[in-house]
């Protein structure tokens, strides 16, 4: 028995619904009474769902799971995970049998967008060129593990005396703090670009420094 | 008629080896999954191993990872375990079963019995 | 140990219904199914009922299957000498990815 799950993982933002998608091709005559279903985590083997009896045997994960009962009988053995979590990341699988057996692991990704980077400065007043600065940038709750990339004015990448930490809420979610040390010249602009490596998404935030005021666009 | 006729098993000392064979007739053998289930003397039913129709799932007991391997041929509608390292503890009849509806098994073989002893 | 858990023996007299428990988890018996399968003494298991209460073709009605929850169970009504046999529940686990069987009854018609 062919069970077809997509090559590439599901993509799905925290909070929100991800269906992992798992399809066979039933025979002619096939009806929802011989159907076995099963969906568990691949790893740990802990059951997530079922289908057995003709009949939804139920969520067995936080009650956050569901069939599509009306594809089921076209071979859609779908499963719907409700409210997305980071620790909902990992391999399903979804096992079915009837009168042969079958079964394919499909991959969740979990992702959630960085926030614009807030930019702060120290000191903060009296600067001069020639003194060193520290530029914190700061990102929240995003998910996976940020690139943080630092460039001045001209676009030339800054990649010494830079420290980025990374610390995981409750929630799993990442707040990212990168912190540029830097001489400065007589202006400048320094720019710190915070990127999801799932989203392909780009989180800018940039402090400019001329003489007196200093602005933070 | 739906037959399932297993050969292949003796005696033999342990760290032995053995393949144990299944021919099958009466059904369309190349569309169903196929197990091996084992007896010990006088006691219970054990399940050793199962496959599916082309072979691409292939499922253990514990008890035998490792050591046994299932496979089949559609061919020539013939199923095989293949037993390396054998132990005592896997002295039994050996049942040949075809896969129903439901995780059941509806037809079985009669049986060959291993016994590994020294 | 087995999985599934079965009462060793069971007893009864001619005509009489006799049940024969068998005892499992969320992961086998809660989320799939059981089957049954008659072991008469010398001979291989037979297929007695699947998916918890069908019964394959061949197979008296005096034989009935059930489940609710993670427990099954086989009643046999109008005991007759000749369903002196092994009886094993089994299933598929999906936290073990493996069927499983019972311990089995031996079931004696006095």
């Known amino acids: 028995l062919e069970v077809q799950v997509p090559e590439d993982p599901v993509v799905a933002l925290v909070g929100t619904d991800a269906t992992l998608c798992c399809s066979f091709s039933p025979e002619p005559g096939f009806s929802l009474a011989q159907l076995n279903l099963i969906w568990q985590l691949t790893d740990t083997k802990q059951l997530v769902h079922s289908f057995a009896e003709g009949q939804d045997q139920g969520s067995a994960y936080a009650n956050r799971t569901a069939l599509f009962p009306d594809l089921l009988a076209q071979g859609n053995a779908s499963l719907r995970l409700q409210r997305v979590r980071v620790a909902d990341e990992g391999s399903f699988t979804c096992f079915v049998s009837i009168r042969d057996f079958g079964s394919a692991a499909v991959s969740l990704q979990v992702a959630a967008p960085y926030s614009k980077p807030s930019m702060t400065l120290e000191p903060n007043k009296d600067l001069r060129p020639g003194d060193t600065v520290t530029i914190t940038c700061s990102s929240y709750r995003g998910y996976p593990e940020a690139e943080v990339f630092w460039q001045d004015g001209q676009g030339v990448p800054l990649t010494g005396n830079v420290t980025t930490s990374q610390m995981a809420n409750e929630q799993g979610l990442f707040d990212v703090h990168s912190v540029l040390r830097v001489v400065l010249g007589a202006n400048g602009t320094y720019s710190c670009l915070v990127r999801n490596p799932v989203l392909q998404q780009d989180a800018h935030g940039s402090v400019t420094i001329t003489g007196q005021p200093m602005t933070f666009p | 008629e739906v037959q399932l006729l297993e050969s292949g098993g003796g005696l033999l000392q342990p760290g032995g080896s053995l393949r144990l064979s299944c021919a099958a007739s009466?059904?369309?053998?190349?569309?169903?999954?196929m197990h091996w289930v084992r007896q010990a003397p006088g006691k219970g039913l054990e399940w050793v191993a199962a496959i599916n129709s082309d072979g691409s799932r292939i499922y253990y007991a514990d008890s035998v990872k490792g050591r046994f391997t299932i496979s089949r041929d559609n061919s020539k509608n013939t199923l095989y375990l293949q037993m390396n390292s054998l132990r005592a503890e896997d002295t039994a009849v050996y049942y040949c079963t075809k896969y129903y509806y439901h995780y059941a098994m509806d037809v079985w073989g009669q049986g060959t019995t291993v016994t590994v002893s020294s | 140990q087995s999985v599934l858990t079965q009462p060793p023996s069971a007893s009864g007299t001619p005509g009489q219904r006799v049940t024969i428990s068998c005892s499992g988890s969320?992961?086998?018996?809660?989320?799939?199914?059981v089957n049954w399968y008659q072991q008469l003494p010398g001979t291989a298991p037979k297929l007695l009922t699947y998916q918890s209460h069908l019964r394959p073709s061949g197979v008296p009605d005096r034989f009935s299957g059930s489940k609710s929850g993670t427990s099954a169970s086989l009643a046999i009504s109008g005991l007759q000498s000749e369903d002196e046999a092994d009886y094993y529940c089994?299933?598929?686990?999906?936290?073990?990815?493996?069927?499983?069987f019972g311990g089995g009854t031996k079931l004696t018609v006095l």
């Open positions: 969320r992961s086998d018996i809660g989320a799939t199914t």
């Open positions: 089994a299933s598929w686990d999906a936290s073990l990815n493996t069927w499983v």
């Open positions: 009466g059904f369309s053998f190349s569309s169903y999954g």
